[in-house]
């Protein structure tokens, strides 16, 4: 059967029919339905939503929809013993306590089971001591404190502002600095955009608002007790002392009203420069400890949260492919939220729901995709990407043999300015071509393409007339598919203007104020940005599942490999003497990149010319494209990060959210001038160059003619 026969309608008409079926009004309705109560992982509320989604996906027409459950380590506050932070006087009396909950937003006063703000997986403890302000608690902030300012955090409680990097990295850095507790807070400089009112009158964070979130350093492990394997009924679980990625010191988040009370008394050193000052009316002194009059006062944390093995539920829907049912294109996003999930995740889940409905409508009319499409509603993403990772661990053998692509679908919006895409270079051309066919929702771009508004508002720093597409990092459910399994992955959402809005993420992220009304009143009243994101995500899935030849361009990988090789070489060249002393050469890497470029070019020529009516040759060429991403996987993984196995990309060791290129070499070079054994350190650089060069060369050879 040809693809057209199998799928009933001409490919062009299919895509148009699919896109035309997507409706903004439906996304709005679904978002409302998904956000009326909290859906915290491991609760009955979230299980009921899983069953509802299962039922509705079946109604929409999917071939099968199953729940996949796992028993994973989660973390919750003690219901009868709340977490808080105090200022205590010399007698140990609590003279100030932080709030125990966020004031509920209007209309939600009677909602039960709103989990109070907490740092998931914090150990229990009641440390007390002097405070040190550590800015964003980034690697460079601790370098500034320890190396330049000679401030010792050992035995101190540190207070860090949210933003710039993943909170788990902040906690890891504080632990390494010897801190005995961490207080995380949202500074208005990062979470209050000028000229906008706070919720409920605008989209800014009120003083009592607090960002929840996990503080793990899992490095892709999934469930902390079952790394590498699914947390099923017969799983062998590690003891809590051997669990992966758990923090060792108590951590708690607060809002800026409470932060003001702690920071206003700070003494000790002045902030080193203006980049350490936020927007509160406090001196931003680093400490340690409080100033003169308050020097005998201390800070005490009271943390009573518990870690519990809890059952979670993924929803997995299948739309069987007509021609290549053993090739899987996956669209997945999470369902669990910290509270109402108005943006994270339900703005994404509502879009997935509408995409499923549209595909189901086509299927009911007799159409099927060429390849199988899997739809996933992941659980426990907020607790460390657990649902997606456990499912991928359970199905890894199928996925590594059959996985064509994974498209992520968390929050559809983090702003309403322009499109934001992070993906494998293999998908660049797919994204470009698709966005040229879609209408821009942006004001001032009526009748223009999405590609045009996106390129104008977010231009590529390298190529004029093209939009910026970023590297994949982590902090979301694509991680296991891309970083561990090497399945081509991508994500798209609408974002803010990063040039004018310097705050981190969106202000109400992971707070109780992330409601349906936030989206409907302030971000996307017409749901036109949601619809556009649905068209991009859905359109990508459609093309990946239905095009006769996979819409991957290996030449784009060649271009970025050269760029990344140049970048890492220039970093290394900051140490010319050592490179000479230790005979460090990048020749092998540049040679491999050159070979990759030439072989990719020849492969692309063959791709234009081959006989697409020959199913064996077609399948062979498509397999070479599918397995190219897989070829960048090193089975041994990165040093000390066995589940980050992609040699070209990994989450930054300093910020899980960010992607790093040639991460093995990058980490080997990082802060190399401070290493006690330079010979060993430069030896590791050489080894990482060798691994990268070999991997690029090996990947190139998968594109060579097979015989």
């Amino acid at each position: 059967k040809s693809s057209n026969e199998a799928t009933n309608i001409t490919p062009k008409h299919n895509m148009k029919a699919f896109l035309d079926e997507l409706k903004a009004e439906n996304i709005k309705k679904f978002l409302y339905n998904f956000t009326q109560i909290p859906h915290l992982a491991g609760t009955e509320q979230n299980f009921q939503l899983a069953k509802q989604i299962q039922s509705q996906w079946k109604e929409f027409g999917l071939d099968s929809v199953e729940l996949a459950h796992y028993d994973v380590l989660l973390s919750y506050p003690n219901k009868t013993h709340p977490n808080y932070i105090s200022i205590i006087n010399e007698d140990g009396n609590e003279i100030f306590n932080t709030s125990l909950f966020e004031p509920p937003p209007p209309g939600y006063e009677n909602v039960s089971d709103i989990v109070p703000p907490f740092s998931a997986f914090s150990p229990q403890g009641m440390p007390e001591g002097d405070l040190v302000y550590v800015n964003y608690a980034r690697t460079e902030d601790f370098f500034k404190l320890e190396r330049d300012m000679k401030i010792n955090c050992s035995g101190k409680i540190v207070i860090a502002r949210y933003g710039k990097v993943f909170r788990g990295n902040k906690v890891k850095n504080a632990q390494l600095a010897g801190a005995k507790g961490v207080i995380l807070y949202s500074d208005p400089a990062d979470y209050f955009a000028p000229g906008v009112k706070s919720y409920p009158d605008g989209w800014n964070l009120p003083g009592g608002g607090v960002q929840r979130g996990n503080i793990l350093n899992l490095n892709g492990a999934g469930d902390p007790l079952t790394p590498g394997y699914p947390a099923n009924e017969y799983a062998y679980r590690r003891g809590i002392a051997e669990a992966v990625g758990l923090p060792s010191i108590p951590v708690h988040p607060i809002g800026y009203y409470d932060a003001q009370k702690l920071l206003e008394k700070m003494g000790g050193s002045a902030p080193p420069d203006s980049s350490w000052r936020g927007s509160l009316k406090v001196p931003y002194n680093v400490g340690p400890g409080f100033t003169g009059n308050f020097s005998t006062q201390k800070v005490k944390m009271h943390i009573h949260s518990t870690n519990e093995v809890t059952r979670i539920y993924n929803v997995i829907g299948t739309l069987r492919g007509a021609v290549e049912p053993d090739r899987y294109v996956i669209l997945g996003g999470h369902r669990d939220s910290w509270v109402f999930g108005g943006i994270d995740p339900q703005s994404g889940a509502a879009v997935v729901h509408e995409i499923v409905r549209s595909f189901g409508t086509l299927k009911k009319e007799g159409w099927r995709p060429r390849r199988t499409i899997l739809f996933a509603s992941w659980d426990a993403e907020e607790f460390g990407l657990l649902g997606s990772t456990e499912w991928a661990e359970e199905n890894s053998r199928l996925l590594q043999e059959r996985g064509v692509a994974y498209i992520n679908a968390d929050s559809s919006i983090e702003g309403n300015y322009t499109l934001r895409v992070d993906c494998t270079p293999l998908m660049y051309s797919l994204v470009h071509n698709l966005t040229k066919e879609l209408k821009s929702p942006d004001e001032g771009f009526e009748g223009k393409s999405l590609y045009e508004s996106w390129t104008k508002k977010s231009p590529s720093p390298e190529f004029s007339g093209m939009p910026r597409i970023s590297k994949l990092g982590s902090g979301n459910d694509f991680e296991v598919f891309f970083q561990r399994l090497g399945i081509a992955s991508g994500r798209a959402r609408y974002t803010k203007n990063w040039e004018t809005n310097k705050f981190s993420g969106y202000p109400l992220y992971h707070s109780v104020y992330e409601t349906y009304e936030l989206v409907e009143k302030f971000y996307d009243p017409m749901f036109k940005y949601h619809l556009t994101v649905a068209q991009v995500r859905g359109g990508m899935v459609f093309e990946l599942a239905n095009s006769i030849v996979l819409p991957f361009d290996c030449r784009d990988y060649a271009v970025v490999l050269r760029k990344y090789a140049d970048k890492i070489y220039s970093i290394s060249m900051k140490h010319p003497q050592e490179m000479k002393t230790y005979s460090v050469s990048f020749d092998s890497l540049f040679s491999a990149v050159k070979n990759f470029t030439e072989i990719a070019s020849k492969f692309s020529e063959r791709l234009q010319d081959f006989d697409k009516s020959n199913p064996i040759v077609l399948r062979m060429m498509n397999d070479q494209l599918m397995f190219l991403e897989r070829a960048f996987i090193d089975p041994l993984g990165l040093p000390d990060r066995p589940f980050y196995r992609h040699v070209i990309y990994a989450p930054s060791s300093h910020n899980k959210y960010a992607g790093e290129s040639f991460p093995g070499i990058y980490d080997a070079l990082f802060d190399i001038e401070s290493k006690v054994d330079p010979s060993k350190a430069w030896g590791e650089v050489k080894r990482q160059i060798y691994v990268a060069a070999f991997t690029v060369q090996a990947a190139a050879e998968t594109l060579s003619e097979v015989a």
């Epitope: 609760t43 509320q45 459950h69 009677n110 039960s112």
Partner: antibody
Framework: EVQLVQSGAEVKKPGASVKVSCKAS????????ISWVRQAPGQGLEWMGE????????YYNEKFRGRVTMTTDKSTSTAYMELRSLRSDDTAVYYC??????????????WGQGTTVTVSS | DIQMTQSPSSLSASVGDRVTITCRAS??????LNWLQQKPGKAPKRLIY???SLDSGVPSRFSGSRSGTDFTLTISSLQPEDFATYYC?????????FGGGTKVEIK
């Protein structure tokens, strides 16, 4: 269809023990716990405790602690409630009810038909 | 322990009447309250969970609401099959406690 089927009526002497069973079907047994509630003749309802078979955790009403033991058999999807040192005021209908195993739940959704326990000398 | 005070203990009403039953919690229980219906010789059946959510298959004439620690079950138009005893149940904190019950009888 979710069903909780309880064992038959029992007549016991004071000081004896009774063990009531509750066989579950129509759902994944380990995804839920079982609560036990009793109702004395003509009286209201009284919560005795609950057990979660996946974790093996039990939570007892202090009033019954030391006299009650709740257990489960995952292989047969059956929950048991044993009450010892029976007194005449333990005469009641004993119900099992399903409860979701999670941090937040909505308490008892499906109930067994009840088991009458009569304590009489 | 949290006390649940239910009123009235009994009421007589006719088919088609609007019936209201209340429960007061001795302390804050949020919205962690269910309403159960029990007919003579039968097991209780849950009608409403989390203060106001109807269980599947429960007619829409049943509704629940909350004002602080006061909870109300309303039957908008009493039907013959609604004559039964109704209990509230708080599950905010252990031990879970029930109201004393309200017997709805035919006038």
């Amino acid at each position: 269809e979710v069903q909780l089927v309880q064992s038959g009526a029992e007549v016991k002497k004071p000081g004896a023990s009774v063990k009531v069973s509750c066989k579950a079907s129509g759902y994944t047994f380990t995804s839920y716990g079982i609560s036990w509630v009793r109702q004395a003749p003509g009286q209201g309802l009284e919560w005795m405790g609950e057990i979660f078979p996946r974790r093996g955790n039990t939570y007892y009403n202090e009033k019954f602690r030391g006299r009650v033991t709740m257990t489960t058999d995952k292989s047969t999807s059956t929950a048991y409630m044993e009450l010892r040192s029976l007194r005449s005021d333990d005469t009641a209908v004993y119900y099992c009810a399903r409860v979701f195993d999670g941090y937040y739940n909505y308490a008892m959704d499906y109930w067994g038909q009840g088991t009458t326990v009569t304590v009489s000398s | 322990d949290i006390q649940m005070t239910q009123s009235p203990s009994s009421l007589s009403a006719s088919v088609g009447d609007r019936v209201t039953i209340t429960c007061r919690a001795s302390q804050d229980i949020g919205s962690s309250l269910n309403w159960l219906q029990q007919k003579p010789g039968k097991a209780p059946k849950r009608l409403i969970y989390a203060t106001s959510s109807l269980d599947s298959g429960v007619p829409s004439r049943f509704s629940g609401s909350r004002s602080g620690t006061d909870f109300t079950l309303t039957i908008s138009s009493l039907q013959p099959e609604d004559f039964a005893t109704y209990y509230c149940l708080q599950y905010a904190s252990s031990p879970y406690t029930f109201g004393g019950g309200t017997k709805v009888e035919i006038k």
